[in-house]
C-alpha cells in the first residue's frame, strides 16, 4: 500500500497511512522505516524496501514491532 501525501502542513516526511498492508514484508527486503506524523488520522509505520517502495503497516502488529526492534538493534 503506497503512502499518501497529507495536506495537513509542512511535515517531514509529509505522508500519512490511510490503509495498511495486508501481508508481511520479508525482513530482508526492508532497508529503513519511519513513523508517520502524530497528526495523521491513523497511526502508521512506513517501511522502505530495498527497491524504494514505501509500505504502510499497522504499528500494533506484533511483526511490525519486532521488525522495528531489529532495525534499532542493527
Amino acid at each position: 500500500t503506497k503512502t499518501e501525501s497529507s495536506s495537513r502542513g509542512p511535515y517531514h516526511p509529509s505522508e500519512c497511512c490511510f490503509t495498511y498492508t495486508t501481508y508481511k514484508i520479508p525482513r530482508q527486503r526492508i532497508m529503513d522505516y519511519y513513523e508517520t506524523n502524530s497528526q495523521c488520522s491513523k497511526p502508521g509505520i512506513v517501511f522502505i524496501t530495498k527497491r524504494g517502495h514505501s509500505v504502510c503497516t499497522n504499528p500494533s502488529d506484533k511483526w511490525v514491532q519486532d521488525y522495528i526492534k531489529d532495525m534499532k538493534e542493527n
Epitope: 525482513r27 499497522n58 506484533k62 511483526w63 519486532d66
Partner: antibody, heavy 122, light 109 residues
Framework: CQSLEESGGDLVKPGASLTLTCTAS?????????MCWVRQAPGKGLEWIAC????????TYYATWAKGRFTISKTSSTTVTLQLTSLTAADTATYFC??????????????WGQGTLVTVSS | AQVLTQTPSPVSAAVGGTVTINCQSS????????LAWYQQKLGQPPKLVIY???KLASGVPSRFKGSGSGTHFTLTISELQCDDSATYYC???????WGFGGGTEVVVK
Amino acid sequence: CQSLEESGGDLVKPGASLTLTCTASRFDFSSAYYMCWVRQAPGKGLEWIACIYAGSSGGTYYATWAKGRFTISKTSSTTVTLQLTSLTAADTATYFCAGSTGNSRGSYFNLWGQGTLVTVSS
Amino acid sequence: AQVLTQTPSPVSAAVGGTVTINCQSSQSVYDNNWLAWYQQKLGQPPKLVIYDASKLASGVPSRFKGSGSGTHFTLTISELQCDDSATYYCQGEYSDIWGFGGGTEVVVK
C-alpha cells in the same frame, strides 16, 4: 521441502529440568517470522506455550501459565530450544515445534514437527 | 486470559454430508480475523486448513470453508469424505499471545 524436527524428549522425575531442541531443515529462520512450541497431553487438545521472533532481536511471547518456568531461545539460525524447569506430571505431553513462515499479517503455524514426548513420572 | 470454546464435540455425519464447527473467543481476536483452523489426525501433527478466518491454506480443498469475525467463527466441511475424520482446532492470535480451542472430533460414517 521445509521441515522441523524436535529432539530432547525423555522420561524424567518430578522437579527435573529438560531442554527440547527444534531444528529446521532446508530453510533457516531468515525465511520465518515466528518459531513456537505447542504441547499436547495424551488424549488431550493443543496448548500453546511460547513463540520467538525469528529475526535478530528475538522477541519472546509466552502463555501466562508458562512464564517463569519455560524459556524459549533461538540458539542458531536453524535451532530453537525450549527449556523446561520444575517439571510435574501435568507437563507430560508431546511437545511440537511449529513455524510461521507465511506472509499473512497474522502468524499462523503452517509448519510443524512430528513432536517429542516428555514423560514426567517418579 | 483469552478462552476459545469449540462446539459441538464430537460431531458425526455421513459421507457426502456437511458438518459445522463453532469457535467462540472470550474476547475479539486481533484485527477481528486473526483466527485459524487446524486438522489433526491420530499420531500426526496438526495441519493448517484455514487462516485469516476464511482463507484456504495451500493444498486444502474448497470443501472447507471458514467464516466469522471478532469472537464468533465457524468451520464448515461439505461433501464429507472418510479422510476428513479428524480433530479440528481453532486458534486465535491476540495482541501478544496465541491460543487454541479445545478441539472438535469429526467422525465421518
